[in-house]
């Protein structure tokens, strides 16, 4: 996992860097829940989806999400979190045509529509952390990262080599 | 150096089983975001895709050759392996291993794969 | 399933020339998700280009991918020697994954 300072160097960099390809070079379809073991689940409300944390009852079926990584051109310090010692965005899509969004204004996950090429509010960093944990850095805002606040997902900015493997940024990753 | 060997006999008789493994050094299968697949390339002939695999066990294989393939992976010893039952002389081919990237399709809900790291190769030949 | 036909079946070319290849898909596919390998006698292919115009970890750049929907090109701007060899474009848009029969350029 990162110290805080390799955090910085890590990302500094992120607002000038390019994904490599426009088309992503793998992907991986799983339920996605928190350190504590609490699923993200998507629903489609009014029209648009919301974004929860939830316990789910015995043999509830969990949501899925496709993770689509990309290379970056910009160098991986760390390995385990990069390709051919380049850096690795993903993307986030529970469904059809909606990816998970970055609101840097109002600090919030959200679920928008759209069409490829997907804005940089689309790409997350991804971090590999302790106890096969993954972390999701925004890459229109270095530091900060896609937690759990209040029983849904928000931004929260890391300041600190403490805050880093802290549990609300912490996510899990499985096929079932 | 991420490097990938296949092994096995490189002769089959027909209707018996033909059985290869794939090791992989200089990477994890396990820690990999990538899948692990099997191509073979029939002598002068192109490319055909036989079947691939995560490293969670899940499977995605060629239909046309579905119902005689099974492919397996054995992530302690960093290996996947492939099981083609019922050979003919038409399955002599050279077979290759390689790391794929999975890409799906949200239309029919399936993966498909292009493969970026190839091993070398071994010839299978099925004759009596 | 998706063919994939490429053409022509052989282009007999010069070193420092350009070479054009041509992969044409029976559907259409939206998403680019084509590759071109390389593959020299008596050797494994190699990947060149994903996501139809993406080069792979240490491709040179005189390799170049183009094309949607239906009809893909490979480039080569300027041929050199190692060049030379069979060049096959594969889908993976749907499953199952396929590839064209290729083309192979040889020296003039």
């Known amino acids: 996992a990162f110290g805080i300072s390799g955090v910085q160097k890590y990302t500094r960099a992120l607002h000038d860097s390019s994904i490599t390809g426009i088309s992503p070079i793998t992907e991986y379809l799983a339920s996605l829940s928190t350190y504590n073991d609490q699923s993200i689940t998507f629903a489609l409300e009014d029209e648009s989806y919301e974004i929860y944390v939830e316990d789910l009852k015995k043999d509830e079926k969990k949501d899925k999400v496709l993770l689509s990584y990309y290379e970056s051109q910009h160098p991986s310090n760390e390995s385990g979190d990069g390709v051919d010692g380049k850096m690795l965005m993903v993307t986030l899509s529970p469904t059809k045509d909606f990816w998970l969004h970055a609101n840097n204004k109002e600090h919030s996950v959200e679920l928008h529509k759209c069409e490829k090429p997907l804005p940089d509010q689309a790409f997350f960093v991804l971090h590999n952390m302790h106890s096969n944990c993954v972390s999701f850095e925004c890459k229109t805002d270095p530091g900060v990262f896609i937690g759990v606040k209040d029983n849904h997902l928000a931004l929260i900015k890391v300041d600190s080599s403490e805050n880093l493997c802290t549990e609300n940024i912490l996510f899990k990753l499985s096929e079932t | 150096e991420l490097q990938l060997q296949e092994s096995g006999p490189g002769l089959v008789k027909p209707s018996e089983t033909l059985s290869l493994t794939c090791t992989v050094s200089g990477g994890s299968i396990r820690s990999s975001i990538f899948y692990w697949g099997w191509i073979r390339q029939p002598p002068g002939k192109g490319l055909e895709w036989i079947g691939s695999i995560y490293y969670s066990g899940r499977t995605y294989y060629n239909p046309a050759l579905k119902s005689r393939v099974t492919i397996s992976v054995d992530t302690s010893k960093n290996q996947f392996s492939l099981m083609l039952t019922s050979v003919t002389a038409a399955d002599t081919a050279v077979y290759y291993c390689?790391?794929?990237?999975?890409?799906?399709?949200?239309?029919?809900?399936?993966?498909?794969?292009?493969?970026?790291?190839w091993g070398q190769g071994t010839t299978v030949t099925v004759s009596s | 399933e998706i063919v994939l036909t490429q053409s022509p079946g052989t282009l007999s070319l010069s070193p420092g020339e350009r070479a054009t290849l041509s992969c044409r898909a029976s559907?259409?596919?939206?998403?680019?998700?084509l590759a071109w390998y390389q593959q020299k006698p008596g050797q494994a292919p190699r990947l060149l280009i994903y996501?139809?115009?993406s080069r792979a970890t240490g491709i040179p750049d005189r390799f170049s991918g183009s094309g949607s929907g239906t009809d893909f090109t490979l480039t080569i701007s300027r041929l050199e020697p190692e060049d030379f060899a069979v060049y096959y474009c594969q889908q993976y848009d749907r499953s199952p994954l396929t590839f064209g029969g290729g083309t192979k350029v040889e020296i003039k």
């Open positions: 390689a790391r794929a990237g999975g890409l799906y399709n949200w239309n029919d809900e399936s993966f498909s794969f292009y493969m970026d790291v």
């Open positions: 996501g139809a115009s």
């Open positions: 559907q259409s596919f939206s998403s680019s998700y």
